[in-house]
Every structure is written in C-alpha cells, then in structure tokens.
C-alpha cells in the first residue's frame, strides 16, 4: 500500500493533467483529491500514466466509493479498466451501451475474459434483460462474448432477438448455454421453409433434444460434422445408422476421422456392427453380428 | 498400391452425355469413399460430388445435381460418373479420388472430356 | 458455399528460400470438439494429377517431404515449403472439407526465381 504522506504546497493538484506523470507514487497518493479525479475522470486515458501510477488513481477510486464506482466514471475508466479485478466489477451497476462498448475496446488484445465476462454480466442485470440492443453491441465488440454469460442471464434473451446472434458468437457456448438458447431459437425461426430453417437453427443445435435431431434427419439437411459433434450425447445415442446417414448426408464419410471422439465414439459403439458396415467407412467396433442388447436401465427403472 | 485407373479421352457433342470409369485396387473396395472433381482446361479444380461404395448412395454439388449420376460396380471395384446434357464449359479433365477420411488421399489420371461441336 | 481465397497467385522464389502460400476461408473450418480443422493442401504438378500434402491443416501424408508444413486454425491457413527445391514447382491449393460443396482456392504457382 502507498504510504500516507502530506503533499508540498507547491505539488497541490487542482486539475488532473499531464504534469501529473511526473509526481511519484506517493506524491499522486498525497496530492490528488480522489473526488477531483472522479470529476475528472475523461482526461485521465489521455494521460500517458504509469501502470504504477493507474495503481495509485484506482487506489483513490477504490477509497472514494466502497461500494462501487458510480457509471460516470466506469464510461471514463479508459486504460484504468485493465486495472480492475471481477470483484471490483461485481459491484458496480451499468447500464449503458456507450460504456460497455468503451471498455470492450480498452480490453481489446489483453487477457480479461474474467472482467469482459464479469461485465457484461452486470450489464445484463443493469439492463434487467439481454436485449437487442445489447446483442447487437456485444457481436459487433466482442465475438463470443454471448457465451461468457451465464445459463440463468441467458434466459433472459427474449425470442425476438436471436434473430442478431451469428454462428460465430456461439462457438465458445457450452452444452448448458444452448440448452436455454435452443428452445427461444426454435421459436424464433418457426415460420421459416426447411432449408433456411436449418441454416439458421444449426448454431443453436448443441441444445437439442433427440425428437428434433430426429426429425432433422428426414429433411435432408446433410448435418456438417462439427455440427453433429455439438450435438448432446443424449441426442445422438438413440440414432440409428440409417438416420445418421440421412441427418449427415455426403459428411457421414467424416466419422472414420472422428471416431475417436465424443459423440461419435460412443455412437458407434452402440450400433450393430452390419449396420454401420453399410457406410463404407471400415467402421469398427460396433456390436457384432447375433448378438442380443439388453437394456438393463429399463429393468431398472422398473423395479 | 493404391490405384485408380480412369477410362480413355473422350469428345462429345453439345447436348450428349459422358460415362467416365474408374477403376480401384490396391485396397478394400467398400471401406473408402470416391469422389469426382473436374478441372477446366487452365482453371481450379472443382468438386461434383462423391460416393459410398457400399452402398452406393451418392451426394452431389447442386451445381450438377440435375446432369451428374455416380454409381458403383463393386463385382469390379469401378466407379462410374455420367454427365448428361453437355456443354462447351464441360470441357475439362475429369478426376475420381479415394478419400483419406474427408480429403482425397489417392487420384486417378484424369479423363479428359472435351465438348465440341 | 464456403468460399477459400488464397494468396498470392504465384511466387517466385530461389532455390533454397522459404516459400509461404496463405489460404483464407469464409467461415471456420475448426471443429471445436475434436480441435481438428477440415483444410487439406494439394500440389499439382505440371500435365499431372493432383497429390495430397497435407490434412487437417497441419498433418503432413506419409511420405511428403518436411520441408512441406501446415499451420493455422479456424479461417486463416498457411502452407510452407522451407527451402525450395526443383522439384517443388508446381499449383498448390487449399480445399476444406468441412461442408459440401467442399471447395478448393484458386491456386497459387510456385516458380524458381
């Protein structure tokens, strides 16, 4: 912690501006007001500080409001940002864009996905839901940056939107995420014929039930790969060969190359042996031939 | 030895169709799948499509989907591409290739089909 | 369709130097599961049939020389031949097999300088 010191009258700061990167350390913690420095807050990113100097205006900061910084001076935070911790964050209350969006730029190329995750977080809650607007800013700022966000804030996306999210700003959403996505996508592309349905719906396709992967596989959608490897386990077990021909189409001919891999692995090993001969692939490990599979979770269940 | 043997140089007429060969040996038949990819003379190259030779269901790029036809022999391990309804930019060498797994692993010589009236 | 732009459309280089082709896909071609990215390299050398050099980005085929490396991830590829040799002229192309129509670049010729 900096020392307490008192400031020389001729060091006394009544305006932040650049002759402030010349005091030290303890000269910055003794000579500037914190109020002064909340006031003032637009000027600081312009101020080519120190790291160690950020250290001692954040320490001013942190003492000046307890409890969280008001957003008047989260919008001006600039370079400053990179100084916060997520608990720092967690107790702040944000609610507008232009801030978000000016401190998704100050993290641009730094390692915070702790602190963006943490912030957006507080300005779902801010906002009191994920609305459009918010979606629009986080794809255009943060690519994937949706899915940092939790299943519970995720609900909160109404249908409507859905419509802004693109493909890439699902590829980090685990199977949770989409599990709450996937229904309000569902929904939100109804109305729309086979092909563009499945076009849309494919991003969001990790959330599926098996009905619906079922049902995907009678509409020649020809499922790429990556897709089907997104897919819960739970929806691809009970799959049959001929359905998984039909759902992949020309991408079946993958699966040698990812058979090694969850689902696919567990895929095969449930499938009779002839069965999965009939894709051409030198698949192995299937049930052999006159072997009889007995489901003992049903027994179970029962008793 | 992996190996792919294409049938002869072909001319056609505007209008008429080609059956291209390729025959396989040098592995088990049915365990990999072919593909068709053509090259117009000084171009890229162009996938139209490939084949399970098991069970003989093909999938083709839907820029040929009305003209082209895959189909398999598996008595003599041949695959066969037809193209109907030809047309001077069909003129091009005409390729079958073994898949490794997606991408193509093993090429024949190409048949080269040329479209003149 | 996933359109794959390479770059640049020939080079020349002397015997011996790197040579570095860049391929550049319209959308990712990494499978996020299995961490394998679906681009495999062909060098087509001149009146003849096209051959494997690489998969899944980075895998060099058995039997393809080491100066040939892969590398790159999610829409952005480079293909790098280490020191030059005679032998080496020919078209290269990059084609992901990630969906259908699987798609190739438009090639890029290497040339002695």
């Known amino acids: 912690d900096v020392e307490r010191t008192t400031c020389p009258p001729e060091k006394e700061v009544h305006e932040i501006d650049e002759s402030l990167i010349f005091y030290k350390k303890r000269e910055l913690e003794a000579c500037v007001d914190a109020a002064l420095l909340a006031a003032q807050m637009d000027r600081v990113d312009a101020i080519p500080f120190t790291y160690e100097q950020l250290d001692v205006l954040k320490h001013k900061l942190d003492e000046l409001y307890p409890q969280g910084y008001p957003e008047s001076v989260i919008r001006h935070l600039g370079h400053l940002f990179l100084k916060m911790s997520p608990e720092d964050i967690r107790k702040w209350n944000v609610t507008s864009l232009e801030t978000l969006k000016a401190l998704l730029k100050v993290s641009k190329g730094h390692e915070m996905s702790a602190q963006v995750a943490t912030l957006i977080d507080r300005v779902v809650v801010g906002r009191g839901q994920l609305d459009k607007d918010t979606v629009d800013t986080l794809t255009a700022f943060c690519p994937g940056c949706l899915c940092s966000l939790s299943p519970e804030r995720l609900s909160s996306v109404p249908p409507s939107v859905i419509g802004a999210v693109r493909p890439q700003d699902l590829d980090t959403c685990g199977p949770r995420q989409l599990d709450v996505l996937y229904p309000k996508a569902r929904l939100a592309f109804q109305n729309m014929s086979g092909s563009e349905y499945f076009v849309k719906i494919r991003p969001f396709l990790g959330g599926a039930p098996t009905e619906d992967v079922k049902a995907l596989s009678q509409q020649n959608v020809s499922m790429d790969l990556a897709t089907f490897m997104k897919l819960r386990r739970e929806a691809v077990l009970p799959l049959t060969v001929a359905e998984v021909q039909k759902l992949l189409g020309p991408h079946v001919e993958g699966l040698k190359v990812e058979e090694q891999h969850s689902p696919v692995r567990d895929w095969i090993l449930k499938q009779r042996q002839d069965d999965l001969d009939t894709l051409g692939l030198g698949l192995q490990g299937g049930i052999p031939n006159g072997y009889l599979i007995l489901d003992l979770s049903v027994r179970e269940a029962l008793s | 030895e992996v190996q792919l043997v294409q049938s002869g140089a072909e001319v056609k007429k505007p209008g008429a169709s080609v059956k291209v060969s390729c025959k396989a040996s040098?592995?088990?038949?049915?365990?990999?799948?072919m593909h068709w990819v053509r090259q117009a003379p000084g171009q890229g190259l162009e996938w139209m499509g490939n084949?399970?030779?098991?069970?003989?269901?093909?999938y083709y790029n839907e820029r040929f989907m009305s003209r082209v036809t895959m189909t398999v022999d598996k008595s003599t391990s041949t695959v066969y591409m037809e193209l109907s309804s030809l047309r001077s930019e069909d003129t091009a060498v005409y390729y079958c290739?073994?898949?490794?797994?997606?991408?193509?692993?093993?090429w024949g010589q190409g048949t080269l089909v040329t479209v003149s009236s | 369709d996933i359109v794959m732009t390479q770059s640049p459309d020939s080079l020349a280089v002397s015997l011996g130097e790197r040579a570095t082709i860049n391929c550049k896909s319209s959308q990712t071609l990494l499978n996020s599961v299995s961490q394998n990215n679906y681009l495999a390299w062909y060098q087509q050398k001149p009146g003849q049939s096209p051959t494997l050099l690489i998969y899944?980005?980075?895998t060099r085929e058995s039997g393809v020389p080491d100066r040939f490396s892969g590398s790159g991830s999610g829409t952005d590829f480079t293909l790098t031949i280490s020191s030059l040799q005679a032998e080496d002229v020919a078209v290269y192309y990059c084609?992901?097999?990630?969906?259908?129509?699987?798609?190739f670049g438009g090639g890029t010729k290497v040339e002695i300088k």
């Open positions: 040098g592995y088990t038949f049915t365990n990999y799948w």
């Open positions: 084949i399970n030779p098991s069970s003989g269901d093909s």
């Open positions: 084609q992901q097999h990630y969906r259908t129509p699987y798609t």
């Open positions: 899944f980005a980075s």
């Open positions: 290739a073994r898949s490794g797994g997606l991408w193509l692993a093993f």
